[in-house]
């Protein structure tokens, strides 16, 4: 039975700045030749029929839900893209993470401007800080990593703060073993 396709993002962020580029790829089942792909944005069928959907110079209207479909196979699970205009944007590799999976956070400056004295906060408390911009890279996420994150930093010698982002780490489902 063909599996549901999966939408992936490159770069992997589902929160991007206005004017940035992102490519959505519909990763399908390898067992059949893909002739065309259907893309849905906020429920509406897109004109794009390739397995990759390129968003160039993102606009606010590009925000929303994206799904893809290969031939008559089920639609993919939705991916949500949000387009921002701000000085700082906290980006995460995923907002819902399975326990044991990696989690990557970065504090991204508008127009890729340098951000320094970057501080990450989790649930209102300073978590990680450094003189220049830096990332948080958790190899194996745990439930304790769930929380509300935001970052602060200086751009052109002025202090800014990102919008908060909720990260949820969920327990991996325990496999069931049946006695033969």
């Amino acid at each position: 039975v063909p599996q549901k396709p999966k939408v992936s993002l490159n770069p992997p962020w589902n929160r991007i700045f206005k004017g940035e580029n992102v490519t959505l790829t519909c990763n399908g089942n390898n067992f059949f030749e893909v002739s065309s792909t259907k893309w849905f944005h906020n429920g509406s069928l897109s004109e794009e029929t390739n397995s990759s959907l390129n968003i160039v110079n993102a606009k606010f209207e590009d925000s929303g839900e994206y799904k893809c479909q290969h031939q008559q196979v089920n639609e993919s699970e939705p991916v949500y893209l949000e387009v921002f205009s701000d000085w700082l944007l906290l980006q995460a590799s995923a907002e819902v993470v399975m326990e044991g999976q990696p989690l990557f956070l970065r504090c991204h400056g508008w127009r890729n401007w340098d951000v320094y004295k970057v501080i990450y906060y989790k649930d209102g408390e300073a978590l990680k800080y450094w003189y220049e911009n830096h990332n948080i890279s958790i190899t194996n996420a745990t439930v304790e990593d769930s929380g509300t994150y935001y970052c602060t930093g200086k751009v052109w010698q002025l202090d800014y703060e990102s919008e908060p982002l909720n990260i949820t780490v969920i327990k991996a489902p325990r496999e069931k073993y049946w006695l033969q």
Partner: antibody, heavy 121, light 111 residues
Framework: EVQLVQSGAEVKKPGESLKISCEGS????????IAWVRQKPGKGLEWMGI????????KYGPSFGGQVTISADKSINTAYLEWSSLKASDTAMYYC??????????????WGLGTLVTVSS | QSVLTQPSSVSGAPGQRVTISCTGS?????????VHWYQLVSGAAPKLLIY???NRPSGVPDRFSGSKSGTSASLVIAGLQAEDEADYYC???????????FGGGTKLTVL
């Protein structure tokens, strides 16, 4: 009470390996950077590098990258400084220090007593 | 040669006031990176004296104060006492080197 307890003095020969330690207590170890600072005999302080135990992010001073390895084991609240092949010029006092954020300033607020490393043939 | 320049030694009689300077550049002190001061007494752990140019941690006597002007910072010790005899280091961050930097240290002698 915050404490950084360093391992004892070491006397080694050139070419030998060494790993010294710094154990933190009295605070949430994984949420603060731990730095290593060198003081050669009669000289000033030099920043060697730093590790954030929460995600093992490590940064090295330009003079020390490739010369030493900084690591940490957050399960036992301990940071390490390691040499694979010591030189006589590594003879120095090595301090570990906690990097904290206080009122927007990033500072070394607590220090260990230092580990004296002597490398001599 | 340290990135932050301090006088190698200063001295003063008990009760006097001494100033230790720390001169940097546009990529450290002049680039809005704070300056902190540490005291090293032989055989003891280094101690934070002043942070963010002017702030004193609890337990540090108010005889110690700090200031900043342009690309320089200063530590002032008023009413010198015998126990102030120590080495003093300023510290900041240098964006062009991407590293934490210390001054060369100043030996304070109480006459």
């Amino acid at each position: 009470e915050v404490q950084l307890v360093q391992s004892g003095a070491e006397v080694k020969k050139p070419g030998e390996s060494l790993k010294i330690s710094c154990e933190g207590s009295g605070y949430r170890f994984s949420s603060y950077w731990i730095a290593w600072v060198r003081q050669k005999p009669g000289k000033g302080l030099e920043w060697m590098g730093i590790i954030y135990p929460y995600d093992s992010d490590t940064k090295y001073g330009p003079s020390f990258g490739g010369q030493v390895t900084i690591s940490a084991d957050k399960s036992i609240n301990t940071a390490y400084l390691e040499w694979s092949s010591l030189k006589a010029s590594d003879t120095a006092m090595y301090y570990c220090a906690r990097l904290a954020l206080i009122r927007g300033s990033i500072i070394f607020d607590y220090w260990g007593l230092g580990t004296l490393v002597t490398v001599s043939s | 040669q340290s990135v932050l320049t301090q006088p190698s030694s200063v001295s003063g009689a008990p009760g006097q006031r001494v100033t230790i300077s720390c001169t940097g550049s546009s990529s450290n002190i002049g680039a809005d990176y704070d300056v902190h001061w540490y005291q090293l007494v032989s055989g003891a752990a280094p101690k934070l004296l002043i942070y963010g140019y002017t702030n004193r941690p609890s337990g540090v006597p108010d005889r110690f104060s700090g200031s900043k002007s342009g690309t320089s910072a200063s530590l002032v010790i008023a009413g010198l006492q015998a126990e102030d005899e120590a080495d003093y280091y300023c510290q900041s961050y240098d964006s062009s080197l991407s590293e934490v930097v210390f001054g060369g240290g100043t030996k304070l002698t109480v006459l």
